[in-house]
């Protein structure tokens, strides 16, 4: 059965940021600011119709 | 550096995997100036069944 939704897994490096333990804790300012910037960025990139949103953001050391 | 992993959702049939990657890659320069994020090593793949329940007839 089709859900009517396509999902894509996307991964990328941010080379001018340093990973630290606060990116493992969603309650920290660093985590929340980066998540907000990334979410806003994706809304800009895929602003044409069809984009439903993003989920499961994870940060890892590069 | 920081590796970011996430899942994007689109209405079915509105974008292919190539355009997901291309549109993101074309935005990298603006991401650097607007968000001060230097992005590299972009990788995109479709999330396989059963997560997206994609394989049935539409």
């Amino acid at each position: 059965l089709s859900t009517g939704v396509s999902f894509f897994f996307l991964s990328f490096h941010i080379s001018n940021l340093q990973f630290n333990s606060s990116l493992e804790d969603p309650s920290t300012d660093y985590y929340q600011e980066l998540q907000r910037d990334i979410s806003e960025m994706f809304l800009q990139i895929y602003k044409q119709g069809g984009f439903l949103g993003l989920s499961n953001i994870k940060f890892r050391p590069g | 550096s920081v590796v970011v992993q996430l899942t994007l959702a689109f209405r079915e049939g509105t974008i292919n995997v190539h355009d997901v990657e291309t549109q993101f890659n074309q935005y990298k320069t603006e991401a650097a100036s607007r968000y001060n994020l230097t992005i590299s090593d972009v990788s995109v793949s479709d999330v396989p069944f059963p997560f997206s329940a994609q394989s049935g007839a539409g």
Partner: antibody, heavy 120, light 107 residues
């Protein structure tokens, strides 16, 4: 109405280059991606690559990346495909084809084709 | 790269016959599958996109179906003007590969 009109047939010697044009009319040239397709005599269709005339972004089939350059002239609403270092296996009909607009994953209009013959 | 395997390579059928051409992708192409018709000496013409959507002006005897890796084009009642070569195309990911074609003839 939408039209893609390609330049005429060419005969070239091995090692030479050729530039094929595709003049678009009847729509806004910069808002549709233009693709190029090869069809060798009696053979099937082979995708070469595309150009987005609005941004000049190009993407090539790896097989053709050292063989072809795609360009576009916005002011003339014309797309170009230049083939380099021609060999006999480059003899083919080359088509330009417009990709439909947003979320349109198909070629809705095709040029009439340009026959490029490579012969010594 | 996604390979598109089209079958049969040629087909001879009678006027009024039901004809089916199949196309198998080497990976899931999520219905980003297009069918074109090419008559001798002419440019290809769009028939079906998104695996099953008929383009404007194409007779309703043509239909597309399938999902995942398996797709087909059916002509419910073959007409003389349907003599042509039919190609499928992957539009899921680059390179946007074509099938090798099916040459359809009238018996």
């Amino acid at each position: 109405q939408v039209q893609l009109v390609q330049s005429g047939a060419e005969v070239k010697k091995p090692g030479a280059s050729v530039k094929v044009s595709c003049k678009a009319s009847g729509y806004t040239f910069t808002t549709y991606t233009m693709h190029w397709i090869k069809q060798a005599p009696g053979q099937g269709l082979e995708w070469i690559g595309y150009i987005n005339p609005g941004s000049d972004y190009t993407h090539y089939n790896q097989k053709f990346k050292d063989k072809v350059t795609l360009t576009a002239d916005k002011s003339a609403s014309t797309a170009y495909m230049e083939l380099y270092s021609l060999r006999s296996e480059d003899t083919a009909v080359y088509y330009c084809a417009r990709q439909g607009n947003y979320a349109a994953y198909y070629f809705d209009y095709w040029g009439q084709g340009t026959l490029v013959t490579v012969s010594s | 790269d996604i390979q598109m395997t089209q079958s049969p390579s040629s087909l001879s059928a009678s006027v009024g016959d039901r004809v089916t051409i199949t196309c198998r992708a080497s990976g899931n192409i999520h219905n980003f599958l297009v069918w074109y018709q090419q008559k001798p000496g002419k440019s290809p013409k769009l028939l079906v996109y998104n695996a099953k959507t008929l383009t404007d002006g194409v007779p309703s005897r043509f239909s597309g179906s399938g999902s995942g890796t398996q797709y087909s084009l059916t002509i419910s009642s073959l007409q003389p003007e349907d003599v042509a070569t039919y190609y499928c195309q992957n539009f899921w990911n680059v390179p946007f590969t074509f099938g090798s074609g099916t040459k359809l003839e009238i018996k």
